[in-house]
Amino acid sequence: NECPELQPPVHGKIEPSQAKYFFKDQVLVSCDTGYKVLKDNVEMDTFQIECLKDGTWSNKIPTCKIVDCRAPGELEHGLITFSTRNNLTTYKSEIKYSCQEPYYKMLNNNTGIYTCSAQGVWMNKVLGRSLPTCLPECGQPSRSLPSLVKRIIGGRNAEPGLFPWQALIVVEDTSRVPNDKWFGSGALLSASWILTAAHVLRSQRRDTTVIPVSKEHVTVYLGLHDVRDKSGAVNSSAARVVLHPDFNIQNYNHDIALVQLQEPVPLGPHVMPVCLPRLEPEGPAPHMLGLVAGWGISNPNVTVDEIISSGTRTLSDVLQYVKLPVVPHAECKTSYESRSGNYSVTENMFCAGYYEGGKDTCLGDSGGAFVIFDDLSQRWVVQGLVSWGGPEECGSKQVYGVYTKVSNYVDWVWEQMGLPQSVVEPQVER
């Protein structure tokens, strides 16, 4: 009652290994690391056979098949490259995830290398079986912003891609009778969030109550250059409109708000986020130069009353930008205190502009980002949001533009976006 000699499968072994096997002897077939027992197209870790009374084995010896991790999972905003020839996905094969550069960067500078494990799963040394995360790169336009040595007099046309974070926010309040329509600017912070001024998203009421406009009445355009041609732009509706809870219409203190987009927008050369600053109560240093872009008034001779009475007719078709220095806080406070009207410049604001005038932000630029280049991180950082200005026409002598000091609100912004600080480290100015 002796059974025939057994040959272990290729890449496998049989235990116990004996010279002879008799009735009722049992053997266990197993495979080397990275291989699985395959019997009747069923994968298993081990397979047992027995020597029968009639001197035959209860089953044929199974084969050992190399473990296959199969096609790796898709990475949002990422790519996969196979390190092994023929795009193999079997044991010890290697793949590399990378993010769609230069628009996305891998969180925590992960290598992105995954190896097919003996268990049949793609494994990374740090993340295990979890996929990496591609976060939007911020503050790095595909087109270089101009040198900040030479001063720009007045505004000039922005080339497409120069301000890829620039958003046009259009509010059409159909709940009003008659319908009300206005617009402002904003800055893209991530694929789903826009930073802007609260006064842009406050319902334009006949009283001083602060009520946000309904999200249904907000449309955001990104990647827009010429307002006459919106075909190349990405337009998105709003999922949420969040005004700072302490926004005060009487002095525009806490003039900051967020719009969450209905769907994340695809990033590209004309649509990229700007970086948020570090939490810094001082804000930008005096005399630092920053850039502001907008579709607001570009004619310095137009008075505020003319702008208001003519509606949107005096707006720029092409995105304009201007370079402005930060004004010392005391100087700005003094310049406004000397004016009639309640013009308090609070610690949540800073001023920018030139004593002699001629360059300024104006109506319609509201909510746009005042960006400063950070030498350390080599990124553009949103330090201000266009908030308000004096009673005289824009660009008047000794009338500085006033901006919301974004660095005072970094924690509030992250909190609203629902992202822990650790996850968003690449977004923060380093």
Epitope: T208, S214, I249
Partner: antibody
Framework: QVQLKQSGPELVKPGASVKLSCKAS????????INWVKQRPGQGLEWIGW????????KYNEKFTDKATLTVDVSSSTAFMELHRLTSEDSAVYFC???????WGQGTLVTVSS | DIVMTQSPSSLAVSAGEKVTMSCKSS????????????LSWYQQKPGQSPKLLIY???TRESGVPDRFTGSGSGTDFTLTISSVQAEDLAVYYC????????FGGGTKLEIK
């Protein structure tokens, strides 16, 4: 077209309460607050308070905080004002208005008498 | 609280005449940031509900005849009817909306 239709006249006894209604139609009810205004016979207008139907936020004239309670029923686009502990001083016409006073109800006369 | 004072309390004019009435507030109703004065004017004809004529001190409500003009800023405001018509017989109220709402006592316009 926009309409605010108020409930009919009320004759109530001193010390009692009364609940007035204001049914809105023809506009976005939740996006526009409802104001309530009092006018005693031969007198001027007095603002009582407002309610914002989207979230139920209310604001009151201090004088009326203990006198009036404002509520809404969004499902029927109706605003309500309940007046408590009525006295002869509360005898007046009460108006509701909306879309920032662009539209007014016809008024409800409340007479407090024993 | 903001107190609104209207004057005169009543006036009588002939049809076709120009009429002005005044409204003064106990504090400024101008918000520099919005460049708006938070003051409205209302007309209430006998036995009717009030009707909004002017908001933000000078913006005419749609459908209001252009003979009605609002002006002023800060604490002093004026409603002008350039050529009074018989149907303008009414009480005119101003209202501040700078801090909650307060109505003035009204100006009664009578036609001679």
């Amino acid at each position: 077209q926009v309409q605010l239709k108020q409930s009919g006249p009320e004759l109530v006894k001193p010390g009692a309460s009364v609940k007035l209604s204001c049914k809105a139609s023809g506009y976005t009810f939740t996006s526009n607050d409802i104001n309530w205004v009092k006018q005693r016979p031969g007198q001027g207008l007095e603002w009582i308070g407002w309610i914002y139907p989207r979230d139920g936020t209310t604001k009151y004239n201090e004088k009326f905080t203990d006198k009036a309670t404002l509520t809404v029923d969004v499902s029927s686009s109706t605003a309500f004002m309940e007046l408590h502990r009525l006295t002869s001083e509360d005898s007046a016409v009460y108006f509701c208005s909306s879309v920032e006073d662009s539209y007014w109800g016809q008024g409800t006369l409340v007479t407090v008498s024993s | 609280d903001i107190v609104m004072t209207q004057s005169p309390s009543s006036l009588a004019v002939s049809a076709g005449e120009k009429v002005t009435m005044s409204c003064k507030s106990s504090q400024s109703l101008l918000i520099s940031r919005t460049r708006k004065n938070y003051l409205s004017w209302y007309q209430q004809k006998p036995g009717q509900s009030p009707k909004l004529l002017i908001y933000w001190a000078s913006t005419r409500e749609s459908g209001v005849p252009d003979r009605f003009t609002g002006s002023g800023s800060g604490t002093d405001f004026t409603l002008t009817i350039s050529s009074v018509q018989a149907e303008d017989l009414a009480v005119y109220y101003c209202k501040q909306s700078y801090n909650l709402y307060t109505f003035g006592g009204g100006t009664k316009l009578e036609i001679k």
